[in-house]
């Protein structure tokens, strides 16, 4: 038998420095976790102790902190090279700065193969990108070879900016011929490494003949066998075993997100490439693991540019940006409108002639807006200003919800109105009218939403049975501020871009902003 150790990360999202336990900015260093310096220590320790080790990343290194905003992917290539990753799969966020923003900083600079079998380039891009990413790679490991085949969410055109010259095919359809090719090359140990979410990972394990192990990402899935070491609740055992259609027992793994854990999977293969055992667990990268001094020094060197960036002007406001709790938790506030407009703008994707855009709606808990911005400072808006407004390091995500769920969410928004609670919703692409004289749970008297399947956007009444796309903070998607109905009833959830980055990009694009209070949220009394 031959034993392989697979170390894996996914959805690191720009967490190059150590973070707090909830993956936000590190405050108390003695309780901080993750970061590339600490990851390197653990990886090196395992490499020294075990003979056949692969370090893999399942995508979404891009996007998440000021590191990505400033360095635009150069930081990913640099530190992944330093850690000597063996392979990476492309995630949807790798396309956030367009194809050029992937090619120049990452694809051309990475010293490891970057993979995706279901992304096909066409037109002028085909020759430009040729060889910069691959469908699969055969890696020598000790005396053996291991095939790694990559895949990426086919929803990427709706979640990022891959442009029109990349076609995202069905994962299973694209993977099978590549796996077959590896088999004809006498490669009998095959890992599918990709970024389509846990449900697709399991389908790949079930349907793609010849895949021995699936290492996934995108859904931030935490798997664990035994008592979990931190706050994350396991979605299943690690590894999660899927029985394929032909009877193979295929281990599927994922390692949560944000570099908090290092996935650690040991696989035993026989001489024919049969998986005869698999076991392991994610390793919590807590402060008991020291940060590697040389990587840490390099991080500190790269950090300097970030501090300078924080105080530079992004754009100007010529109006007061009212982000006070007195406004945003009680009524429509122009800071809420600004943020929602930025959220929609960040999700403009003209992928279908029938639709002016795939999504038109935004909701945002008023309690997530933590500060106003005064225009009487020459109108200047900096990253530092925005960090005070949005200090939690969240993301603005895309979900699909039924109209009935949205109605419940708006009822929850005002179920205890007047107590300055954070669940009061700010909106974009929505006109809501509340009647506070009615009993809680029955206060929404009008709810109109902006059409998407139209050439001239207009507001139509919400339909209870229709499925709508909505942009919202990850906090709400996860049921925060009591929005349990969103968490329980959402039909799809794709994580999006860093909140501050979305707003800063919008302000930089607009140059001068003047958001108004314009009647998105209204109150009435009596019959309607």
């Amino acid at each position: 038998a031959w034993e392989l150790t697979i170390l894996h990360t996914n959805d690191v999202h720009s967490r190059l420095e150590q973070t707090s336990e909830d993956s936000s900015k590190c405050v108390n260093a003695s309780r901080c976790m993750g970061g590339v310096a600490r990851l390197f220590t653990k990886v090196q320790q395992i490499r020294r102790a075990e003979p056949n080790v692969l370090l893999l990343d399942a995508g979404d290194q891009y996007q998440g902190t000021i590191w990505f905003t400033v360095y635009k992917g150069a930081e990913v290539a640099h530190f992944m090279n330093a850690l000597r990753y063996d392979a990476m799969a492309l995630g949807n966020h790798e396309f956030d700065n367009g194809v050029e923003g992937l090619i120049e900083p990452l694809l051309k600079e990475a010293k490891f193969p970057i993979l995706s079998a279901n992304i096909k380039a066409k037109g002028p891009l085909a020759s430009q990108i040729s060889g910069l990413y691959l469908p699969y790679k055969v890696l020598p490991v000790g005396d053996e070879v291991v095939g790694i085949v990559g895949y990426t969410s086919k929803e990427t055109p709706f979640l990022s900016n891959p442009g029109t010259n990349l076609v995202f095919e069905d994962e299973i359809t694209a993977l099978q011929p590549e796996v077959d090719k590896l088999k004809t090359l006498n490669v009998n140990k095959i890992i599918a490494l990709g970024h389509s979410g846990f449900e697709m990972d399991k389908l790949i394990a079930q349907k793609v003949r010849g895949v021995d192990v699936v290492v996934g990402g995108h859904s931030n899935t935490f798997l664990y066998t035994g008592n979990p070491p931190s706050k994350e609740v396991p979605a299943g055992k690690y590894p999660f075993i899927v029985t394929s259609d032909d009877g193979r027992k295929v281990p599927v793994v994922q390692a949560y997100a944000f570099g908090k854990y290092l996935g650690y999977l040991k696989i035993e293969f026989d001489e024919r490439g049969n998986v005869i055992s698999s076991h392991g667990n994610p390793i919590l990268l807590n402060s008991s693991i020291p940060e590697d001094p040389s990587i840490k020094a390099d991080i500190n060197k790269w950090r300097i540019k970030l501090d300078n960036y924080s105080t530079q002007e992004l754009g100007k406001t010529i109006v007061y940006l009212d982000g006070s709790s007195q406004s945003c938790r009680f009524r429509e506030c122009n800071m809420g409108n600004l943020i929602c407009d930025a959220m929609i703008n960040n999700n403009l994707r003209h992928t279908d002639e029938m639709f002016w855009n795939h999504v038109s709606m935004c909701i945002l808990n008023g309690g997530g807006i933590r500060s106003p911005i005064d225009e009487r400072n020459n109108g200047t808006i900096t990253w530092e200003n925005l960090a005070a407004v949005l200090p939690f390091g969240g993301t603005f995500d895309l979900v699909q919800l039924k109209g009935s769920t949205l109605k419940k969410a708006f009822e929850h928004s005002v179920h205890r109105y007047g107590q300055s609670t954070g669940e009061f919703l700010q909106v974009g692409g929505i006109h809501v009218v509340y009647d506070l004289s009615r009993k809680p749970g029955d206060r929404v008297v009008k709810l109109d939403v902006l059409c998407t399947k139209c050439r001239v956007p207009s507001y139509d009444p919400l339909k209870m049975d229709e499925v709508y796309k909505v942009i919202l903070p990850n906090f709400l998607a996860n049921g925060g501020d009591g929005f349990q109905m969103i968490k329980d009833e959402l039909l799809r959830h794709d994580s999006g871009d860093q909140d501050i980055n979305v707003v800063s990009t919008y302000i930089s694009k607009m140059k001068v902003i003047y958001p108004a209070v314009e009647g998105r949220i209204k109150f009435s009394t009596g019959s309607h």
Partner: antibody, heavy 119, light 107 residues
């Protein structure tokens, strides 16, 4: 070396049940499917089903569904195949074999167990 | 279920002859085709897996070819110990199914 050793010949009456054992050695018993194949006198090979000892997952062919039960005892690395409601046309040699799941070939076979069903 | 049909059912040949046995699947099975040899009173032995890959210890005079639905087992120079019955088996889709066998006899 890798081997599968089966229990001895059986003579049964119609309507009775038979339980054939298959003891594995020389490999990780829980890591491979055990396949059961039978061969009637002068006939070809017929796949009956399989069991994965690692989690007791089973697959039975439609023909034997409801009549066959495959089990495994990992503590003694032994798989069992029980066939109930025996008929005379169940007279055959019953083989266990180890399945390789990369190609679903059967690379190691037991010596066979002759089951005779006769009144 | 996938039907496997072998031809011929039996053949007579002499030592040193080149012998070819064919196996046809009722639907595409890619390359998931395996060949076995069985001698009277003995258990079958794996010869070839995945159409053309020789199982360890099998002499190189045995070879396999084909893909999709049509497959061939070839013995380049028949030896005395090769007189036996040969079975093909598909490993593409459950339930696994065997051909009816081809008996190779001494002429």
């Amino acid at each position: 070396q890798v081997q599968l050793v089966q229990s001895g010949a059986e003579v049964k009456k119609p309507g009775a049940s038979v339980k054939v054992s298959c003891k594995a050695s020389g490999y990780t018993f829980t890591g491979y499917w055990i396949q059961w194949v039978r061969q009637a006198p002068g006939q070809g090979l017929e796949w009956m089903g399989a069991i994965y000892p690692g989690d007791e997952d089973t697959r039975y062919t439609q023909k034997f569904q409801g009549r066959v039960t495959m089990t495994a005892d990992t503590s003694i690395s032994t798989a069992y195949m029980e066939l109930s409601r025996l008929r005379s046309d169940d007279t055959a040699v019953y083989y266990c074999a180890r399945g390789n799941w990369d190609d679903w070939d059967f690379d190691v076979w037991g010596q066979g167990t002759t089951v005779t069903v006769s009144s | 279920d996938i039907q496997m049909t072998q031809s011929p059912s039996s053949l007579s040949a002499s030592v040193g002859d080149r012998v070819t046995i064919t196996c046809r699947a009722s639907q595409d099975i890619s390359n998931y085709l395996n060949w076995y040899q069985q001698k009277p009173g003995k258990a079958p032995k794996l010869l070839i897996h995945y159409t053309s890959r020789l199982h360890s210890g099998v002499p190189s005079r045995f070879s396999g070819s084909g893909s999709g639905t049509d497959f061939t087992l070839t013995i380049s120079s028949l030896q005395p110990e090769d007189f036996a019955t040969y079975y093909c088996q598909q490993g593409d889709t459950l339930p696994w199914t065997f051909g009816q066998g081809t008996k190779v006899e001494i002429k």
